[in-house]
Amino acid sequence: LTCLGGFASPGPVPPSTALRELIEELVNITQNQKAPLCNGSMVWSINLTAGMYCAALESLINVSGCSAIEKTQRMLSGFCPHKVSAGQFSSLHVRDTKIEVAQFVKDLLLHLKKLFREGQFN
């Protein structure tokens, strides 16, 4: 995470800070998981493309009453330009596949780390 600095800061929160905090929160969730995350709730899998932040929020927002991911839900709203409501779906969802929230978080984290290795963040 020490490599994530140095971005331009066109918005109110520097993009590097927002991303660092999102990744740190995903790391916390995966590391601190004892009981099944969100009682084993299932969410729609998503295609991990450049629009994945909105898709991830659309998927996770359908999980209610799970305090462990509330911060992630709030943070993802800062990455999605559009208003996201429960029950809303874009074509980024692979709607024939549901996975556990724990696996969803793990996949998202791994993908973000992969993108950093590839230098895909401005």
């Epitope: 559009h82 996201v84 874009s90 980024l92 895909q120 401005n122």
Partner: antibody, heavy 115, light 104 residues
């Protein structure tokens, strides 16, 4: 039917200011991120700025950063672009563009010319 | 900053022929690439997003392929209304910066 109608373009001297407006209809404006994209005469497309559905985040192309400000009034279904310290190279048709979850530019206005 | 290069700059074709347009990114953009069509005096129109997904209302003769750095837009059999400028486009993952190719 989604409609985006730009206005406010015209001829302006270098160094002066201009404000463009975009009236949106046919969709729930307050739910969507919006962009400005421009096209210089005979040239290609250049993204200018994006604003979040609630105005909470704004991002700009390097070429306009510090000079242009994107804003919106959701009660009026209107998007704005305040352009200060205008330069000759800002001459272009300015398009107002709607985004969606996975498609940044899914509906475009017809554009307004700034010279 | 990712730079998109399109080739050829100009493609001369006739109705009924197959047209293949290329877009190359200076670094990997995964599968996030879109194609737009623009006719003189008109606003651009979305054709393809996420490299290969046709937008609503786009005829099946338009198809997109590729991933990483090399992408292709294919028009299987050109119709008279297909003669236009085509732009490829990508967005960075974060922050949201949007880039267009120079057009074909």
């Amino acid at each position: 039917e989604v409609q985006l109608v730009e206005s406010g373009g015209g001829v302006v001297q270098p160094g002066r200011s201009l404000r463009l407006s975009c009236a949106a209809s046919g969709f729930t404006f307050s739910n969507y991120g919006m962009h400005w994209v421009r096209q210089a005469p005979g040239k290609g497309l250049e993204w200018v700025a994006i604003i979040w559905y609630d105005g909470s985040n704004k991002y700009y192309a390097d070429s306009v950063k510090g000079r242009f400000t994107i804003s919106r009034d959701n009660s009026k279904n209107t998007l704005y672009l305040q352009m200060n310290s205008l330069r000759a190279e800002d001459t272009a048709v300015y398009y107002c563009v709607k985004g969606s979850g996975d498609i940044p530019f899914d509906y475009w206005g017809q554009g307004t010319l700034v010279t | 900053e990712i730079v998109l290069t399109q080739s050829p700059a100009t493609l001369s074709s006739s109705p009924g022929e197959r047209a293949t347009l290329s877009c190359r990114a200076s670094q990997s953009v995964s599968s996030y690439l879109a194609w737009y069509q623009q006719k003189p005096g008109q606003a651009p129109r979305l054709l393809i997003y996420d490299a290969s997904n046709r937008a609503t209302g786009i005829p099946a003769r338009f198809s997109g392929s590729g991933s990483g750095t090399d992408f292709t837009l294919t028009i299987s059999s050109l119709e008279p209304e297909d003669f236009a400028v085509y732009y490829c486009h990508q967005r960075s993952h974060w922050p949201p910066i949007f880039t267009f190719g120079p057009g074909t």
